[in-house]
Each structure stands twice: as structure tokens, then as C-alpha cells.
């Protein structure tokens, strides 16, 4: 069986300030079991944007129903974009662990650029 791949098809996305940004992500397999998280940036300084397992992420909506059986689409939409949202976003698959889940595989990233709001 092929190992899971995390696919972020767009290298870059550009939106105007105040608009919503859709960041696409798909998995090639349901295995291993574990949550998906989205981060802005990489390494220790990365910002958690969305955690499928826990937390309240008011500006983020999932494009498809993540709890739906056999769902492989983990795309998100971030509303009311500001300049501080600019950066590279990574869709990351975690493997269920105890006590903490373990990072399994990351997508290649999608760079979000923010244009000035049209006047």
C-alpha cells in the first residue's frame, strides 16, 4: 500500500485584504489515523491556524465536511484576510499518539500574498 501523500496543489494564492482565501489540501490515504493541522510558517515559530481535533478557529472554515467518512479533502478558507496573514501555509498530517499526536507528513506549502484592498 502506498504511503500517504499530502497534496497542496497551489504553490501560491493571492487575495485582497478583507477577502477570504481558500487553501487547498488533499490526502491520498486515510491511513495513518490522526488529525490534520494547518500552520502558517515552518519550524518552531510556526503559527497554528487550524486543528481538526481541538480548539476554536473562528476565521477558518473547512471546505468539505471533515468528519464525513472517507473524506480526503482538508482544504480550508480563511476569512477577512489582513496583511499579517501573508506567508506560507502548510497542511500537516499527524499520526495518533499518546499522550501527543506525532507529526507524520507535511504538504509542500502554499504561499499566501495579500494585495491592498481596492479603493
Amino acid at each position: 500500500e502506498d504511503e500517504l501523500q499530502v497534496i497542496q496543489p497551489e504553490k501560491s494564492v493571492s487575495v485582497a485584504a478583507g477577502e477570504s482565501a481558500t487553501l487547498r489540501c488533499a490526502m491520498t490515504s486515510l491511513i495513518p489515523v490522526g488529525p490534520i493541522m494547518w500552520f502558517r510558517g515552518a519550524g518552531a515559530g510556526r503559527e497554528l491556524i487550524y486543528n481538526q481535533k481541538e480548539g476554536h478557529f473562528p476565521r477558518v472554515t473547512t471546505v468539505s465536511e471533515l468528519t464525513k467518512r472517507n473524506n480526503l479533502d482538508f482544504s480550508i478558507s480563511i476569512s477577512n484576510i489582513t496583511p499579517a496573514d501573508a506567508g506560507t501555509y502548510y497542511c500537516v498530517k499527524f499520526r495518533k499518539g499518546s499522550p501527543d499526536d506525532v507529526e507524520f507528513k507535511s504538504g509542500a506549502g502554499t504561499e499566501l500574498s495579500v494585495r491592498a484592498k481596492p479603493s
Epitope: 485584504a17 478583507g18 502558517r40 510558517g41 519550524g43 518552531a44 515559530g45 510556526r46 503559527e47 497554528l48 491556524i49 486543528n51 481541538e54 480548539g55 476554536h56 478557529f57 473562528p58 476565521r59 477558518v60 477577512n80 489582513t82 496583511p83 499579517a84 496573514d85 484592498k117
Partner: antibody, heavy 119, light 108 residues
Framework: DVQLVESGGGVVRPGESLRLSCAAS????????MNWVRQAPGEGLEWVSR????????DYADSVKGRFTISRDNSKNTLYLQMNSLRAEDTAVYYC????????????WGLGALVTVSS | ETVLTQSPATLSVSPGERATLSCRAS??????LAWHQQKPGQAPRLLIY???NRATGIPDRFSGSGSGTDFTLTISSPQTEDSAVYYC??????????FGGGTKVEIK
């Protein structure tokens, strides 16, 4: 209910150190960026420092850069502020504040801890 | 760096008399502006976020408006318990997070 409770305040001499703690409950602490904000006697609010959800990303006000260190222990649901080389102008009530999401306003505040720097 | 200027510094109104507080940003902050209330001896409390959305549990006599650089907090019919200092906060550009200097509201 979200609760943020600061501790560790007190009276110190200029040049000394102090560590503040903020115990968090009622929300998924590990999912949110946290901040310290201070208020000198009779003055307004001044943002001091921010730490991202994972603890690897930090920001500081110019007035405290190089002297203060923000950190967090997600296993203990606790935020810290290590304050070194304290000055008289650091005298203030220090509040910990939770962010609504990573790029957003402060939706909950602690009750505050008074730090007095005096010779 | 975005500077927030609040006016007036002090506002004295009678109970039931409309109170209007202003916050002006030195550059656009879109709708990314919040208002916090701080009563004497207490911690700040979030009132309004994204310029016009009331936080949970905030009475509807509090309303926010504006976008870009000019924002208003209105207390439609102030009660004695609304005596407090009100701060605006921008979160469009950061760090640093910036607060306005505050408006002290006194209910006569």
C-alpha cells in the same frame, strides 16, 4: 468558563529579576497564542509580549526586548514572563491575555499581577 | 507603526444620554479594531471586535462602527455601571499590538 490567573508579582529592586506565571483553564490552551500586557499606575495599556501556540515564536515590545522572556508550558496550561534587569519604569500591573485566534484581538484577560520596582 | 488616537480623553454624560467615543488610526486597519472596557481596579474586558461585533454577554446598548481609519463606540443609553475607561486596539498590523490612550467615561 475561561480563566486566567496571574501570580508571582511583588516588590523588587532595580536590576533584580522576577518571574510571572499565568495559569489558564476553560479552553484548549495549546491551541492559542498568548500575550502579556501591562499598565503602569494611572496609565493606559501597553502590549509587552506575545508567544505563539506552540511556544516557538515570540514577539516583544522594544521597551522590554533583551530583558524579558515569554514562554509557556502547554502540558501545565501555564504562561510565563521572566523579567530581568528590572527598572523603575517596569512598575505596572501585568495582565496575561488570550488571543481569539492567531491573528486577532484579545478576548480574555487575567486579573493582573502587580510588579513594583523600587529602591 | 500604527498609532491609535482616542477622543475625547474624558466624557461626562448623564444616565440615558448617548455617549460617543472616537478612535482614529494613523493608517488603515480595515475592520480589525476592538474595544475594551476597564472599570476601576478591574482587568480589561472585551466589548466589541472586528469594529462592530459585540462580544459574548455584552449588552446591546454598546455598539461599534467604522472602518479604515475612523471608528466609533456608542453607548446608546449609559448606565451608572458603564463608568470606565474604554480602549481601542488594532490588530491589522502587528507586532506591536497597539492600544489607544483611552477615553474615561463618567456617568453623572
Amino acid at each position: 468558563d475561561v480563566q486566567l490567573v496571574e501570580s508571582g508579582g511583588g516588590v523588587v529592586r532595580p536590576g533584580e529579576s522576577l518571574r510571572l506565571s499565568c495559569a489558564a483553564s476553560g479552553f484548549s490552551f495549546r491551541s492559542y497564542a498568548m500575550n502579556w500586557v501591562r499598565q503602569a499606575p494611572g496609565e493606559g495599556l501597553e502590549w509587552v509580549s506575545r508567544i505563539n501556540s506552540g511556544g516557538g515564536g515570540t514577539d516583544y515590545a522594544d521597551s522590554v526586548k533583551g530583558r524579558f522572556t515569554i514562554s509557556r508550558d502547554n502540558s501545565k496550561n501555564t504562561l510565563y514572563l521572566q523579567m530581568n534587569s528590572l527598572r523603575a519604569e517596569d512598575t505596572a500591573v501585568y495582565y496575561c491575555a488570550k488571543q481569539y485566534d492567531w491573528n486577532s484581538f484579545f478576548d480574555y484577560w487575567g486579573l493582573g499581577a502587580l510588579v513594583t520596582v523600587s529602591s | 507603526e500604527t498609532v491609535l488616537t482616542q477622543s475625547p480623553a474624558t466624557l461626562s454624560v448623564s444616565p440615558g444620554e448617548r455617549a460617543t467615543l472616537s478612535c482614529r488610526a494613523s493608517q488603515t486597519v480595515g475592520s480589525k479594531l476592538a474595544w475594551h472596557q476597564q472599570k476601576p481596579g478591574q482587568a480589561p474586558r472585551l466589548l466589541i471586535y472586528d469594529a462592530s461585533n459585540r462580544a459574548t454577554g455584552i449588552p446591546d446598548r454598546f455598539s461599534g462602527s467604522g472602518s479604515g481609519t475612523d471608528f466609533t463606540l456608542t453607548i446608546s443609553s449609559p448606565q451608572t455601571e458603564d463608568s470606565a475607561v474604554y480602549y481601542c486596539q488594532q490588530y491589522y498590523y502587528w507586532p506591536p499590538y497597539r492600544f489607544g490612550g483611552g477615553t474615561k467615561v463618567e456617568i453623572k
